[in-house]
Interface confidence: low
């Protein structure tokens, strides 16, 4: 348009795609009567009449703007709805009277791009490449105008650097007029970049100002040769027999080499390959002392066929051998003495303890237990515990039974049992002695005998309560080579008229078992209403 270069810069109107642009004709009354205005769009220096205003009434011209234009603000403003990128051009209003005057408006259109989509190079990057390799691609779709992309590594912007960093950006125009930006980051990476976080940022403008959108952070697979191979043992610390032990090979390269684990044969001093699981881990479960020895790992790079050997690692599986006690089955007369000696081997210093089996009481801290002036109560179990104090849980034990010669010895001498007539009673009688006694009953019934330990026996008798049985009572007799002994059970009928639920009797029912070395009569269990000892 002639003389357009001398005209003042057009007024700038900025809108987002899809919104309405308000084009206000800035002619003053002296420049032209706004009741008579023509509106033009200018594209590639070509003017096209798009709207006429006559006496304040508007009329669209046929064409691309026909459906989207309307008058506002008493005819001073032209509203353009559903703005598209193609609308970014100059619009001008021209007043007709008293002489032709123009007012130009530059419409700028903006659209925020979608969130940037970042795709890392899935094939990864070798560190020894001669030129920058593709790290990742960033795509920002449907923005207007073309957004700017900035790449970041570990939160710092990346700049073009000859032979090291190259950013290659291209854009395509969608049918909507919006741009899709694709940016490829190429870089020469080093080993330390294996954990580097890359992301891209799109910078764009809207009428409200400058904005940016960031992609997610990605890491790129970085391939670098192995320089060192080493062994790692789990768990860390002192190992003991029975542990689950894992020996694995590690390398500082990516991808890791092919691993094999070998153990030195203590006889031949040759390295013998061990069988690992699918993950290349040697699992020792349960670990045994034979697993102790010198292990090493070999890493073979299948590309270069270069083999690397780890530093050898000594594995020590700590153990305690079977515990031996001598004498193994001691027998003594009452009043004599006995020395028990405990032996075991271990990879570490051992501590010994002697415990009384029945009570758990510690009798001696050391391998030798001396017992003097033996009484029959001293008969029974003694346990030697050999343990490694520096390794919790590493111990072995051995039980030895001390037998004291003597005639049978009853758990109780006599006992009262409450019964009802015609019920089946379950009676028990216990005796100990060395040699172990046998038990007989003075009444017919079903009797069974159970060996409780080498010196102790328990006999149980099932018998029907009859008047005769009430009359005679029940006796059990224990006998061995050194003598015999008897216990008596008195049977008494439950009398419900005299024993009411409120009566506070303590003569309830008794079981016929007692600890093997308790001389006292058995304890009685308190009951409000006595019941028979056992129902048949």
């Amino acid at each position: 348009v002639p003389g357009e270069a001398e005209q003042p810069a057009p007024e700038l109107v900025e809108v987002e795609v899809g919104s309405t642009a308000l084009l206000k004709c800035g002619l003053s009354q002296s420049q032209g009567n706004l009741s008579h205005v023509d509106w033009f769009s200018v594209h590639k220096e070509k003017r096209t009449l798009i709207f006429r205003v006559r006496q304040g009434q508007g009329q669209s011209e046929p064409g691309e703007y026909e459906q989207r234009l309307s008058l506002q603000d008493r005819g001073a403003t032209l509203a353009l709805t559903q703005v598209t990128p193609q609308d970014e051009r100059i619009f001008l209003c021209q007043g007709k009277r008293p002489r032709s005057q123009e007012y130009r408006i530059q419409l700028r259109v903006y659209k925020a791009p979608e969130e940037p989509n970042i795709q890392v190079n899935p094939l990864g990057i070798p560190v020894n490449s001669k030129e920058p390799e593709e790290v990742a691609t960033c795509v920002g779709r449907n923005g207007y105008p073309i957004p700017q992309v900035i790449w970041y590594k570990n939160g710092r912007p990346l700049k073009e650097e000859k032979n090291r960093v190259h950013i290659q950006s291209s854009q395509t125009v969608e049918s909507s007029g919006l741009y899709t930006l694709q940016s490829i980051l190429k870089a020469q990476l080093v080993k330390e970049d294996k954990d580097a976080q890359f992301y891209c940022e799109l910078n764009y403008r809207l009428p409200s100002g400058n904005h940016m959108k960031e992609s997610r952070e990605v890491t790129v697979p970085v391939f670098y040769p192995t320089e060192k191979v080493w062994l790692e043992v789990e768990p860390v610390g002192m190992l003991k027999e029975g542990d689950r032990v894992e020996i694995r090979c590690l390398a500082d390269g990516n991808p890791p080499p092919h691993f094999s684990i070998s153990k030195q044969n203590p006889s031949t001093r040759e390295a013998e390959e061990e069988t690992t699981n699918d993950n290349g881990v040697l699992v020792l479960e349960p670990a045994r002392k034979e697993h102790s020895g010198r292990y090493e790992c070999q890493g073979l790079d299948l590309d270069t066929m270069i083999s690397l050997l780890s530093e050898p690692q000594e594995l020590l599986v700590n153990y305690v051998s079977d515990v031996r006690v001598s004498p193994a089955a001691p027998e003594r007369q009452e009043g004599s003495s006995l020395t028990l000696t405990c032996e075991a081997e271990s990879s570490q210093d051992l501590e010994f303890q002697w415990l009384r089996e029945e009570t758990g009481q510690v009798l001696e801290r050391g391998p030798v237990l001396q017992l003097h002036d033996l009484k029959r109560e001293a008969g029974g179990g003694y346990r030697c515990v050999a343990s490694v104090p520096s390794i919790p849980g590493l111990n072995r034990t051995q039980l030895v039974n001390v037998a004291i010669f003597g005639p049978p010895w009853m758990a109780f001498k006599e006992r009262k049992v409450w019964v009802k007539e015609n019920m089946v009673l379950n009676l028990s009688c216990e005796a100990s002695g060395h040699p172990r006694p046998t038990i007989s009953w003075n009444v017919n019934g079903t009797a069974s005998e159970q060996d409780q330990d080498p010196q102790r026996v328990l006999s149980t008798l099932n018998v029907l309560v009859t008047p005769e049985l009430l009359e005679t009572g029940v006796e059990c007799t224990a006998s061995n080579d050194l003598g015999k002994n008897t216990s008596i059970l008195f049977l008494e009928l439950v009398n419900l008229t005299t024993l009411t639920p409120d009566s506070n009797t303590t003569t309830g029912l008794s079981t016929s078992t007692a600890s093997p070395h308790t001389r006292a009569n058995s304890t009685s269990t308190e009951r409000k209403l006595p019941e028979p000892e056992s129902r048949g």
Partner: antibody, heavy 115, light 112 residues
């Protein structure tokens, strides 16, 4: 959430050295810079340098080169500032701050240099 | 070194009124990537500074929208559109375009 926790106050004599620690949590320590900034009593802020824990790379304010050393221990997600040959003018609160944009700060460590 | 000059040194504003702090750089902070590397920090007594604005106009996470940043390559403004009691603090601007990173001398904002 991101947290930077610094070591406690220090009282040092001129000529001595001091080492201030800054323990990070709530984010990937090896992925972001740690900056160090100091503030003398009643004064403004002075940037000392940064370290990138991912590879140990550093950049110092020329004013502190040779006297300040930045380091990290990634196994415990901790950054360190060591200053040697302390002078009375080094009396200040020393801050660590994360990232290129200093988006999170430690609570500060007061270092007093006095004979 | 890039010199950052802040003005005024102190500022007293009534609650609910607008507060404006200026910052001038001895060199353009518009970098060739198209971004302006200027940040604003708020520091309350006995506390570390807190990032308010970075890249001249981008609000940091969790910062109320009454804080805004604007400017050109060398002249910058932090605006608090409606001053609240909790905004009493010293405000610093900072450049990140060139080593050493430098801060302005600070502006103390008080309530009138």
């Amino acid at each position: 959430q991101v947290q930077l926790v610094q070591s406690g106050s220090e009282l040092k004599k001129p000529g001595a050295s001091v080492k201030v620690s800054c323990k990070a949590s709530g984010y990937t320590f090896t992925s972001y810079d740690i900056n160090w900034v100091r503030q003398a009593p009643g004064q403004g802020l002075e940037w000392m340098g940064w370290i990138f824990p991912g590879d140990g790379s550093t950049d110092y304010n020329e004013k502190f080169k040779g006297r300040a050393v930045l380091s990290t221990d990634t196994s415990v997600s901790t950054a360190y500032l060591q200053i040697s040959s302390l002078k009375a003018e080094d009396t200040a609160v020393y801050y660590c701050a994360r990232y290129h944009f200093f988006d999170n700060w430690g609570q500060g460590t007061t270092v007093t240099v006095s004979s | 070194d890039i010199v950052i000059t802040q003005s005024p040194l102190s500022l007293a504003v009534s609650l609910g009124e607008r507060a404006t702090i200026n910052c001038r750089s001895s060199k353009s902070l518009l970098y060739k990537d198209g971004k302006t590397y200027l940040s604003w920090f708020q520091q309350k007594p006995g506390q570390p500074p807190q990032l308010l604005i970075y890249l001249m106009s981008t609000r940091a996470s969790g910062v109320p929208d009454r804080f805004s940043g604007s400017g050109s390559g060398t002249d910058f403004t932090l605006t608090i559109s409606s001053l609240q009691a909790e905004d009493v603090a010293v405000y610093y601007c900072q450049q990140l375009v060139e080593y050493p990173y430098t801060f302005g001398g600070g502006t103390k904002v008080e309530i009138k």
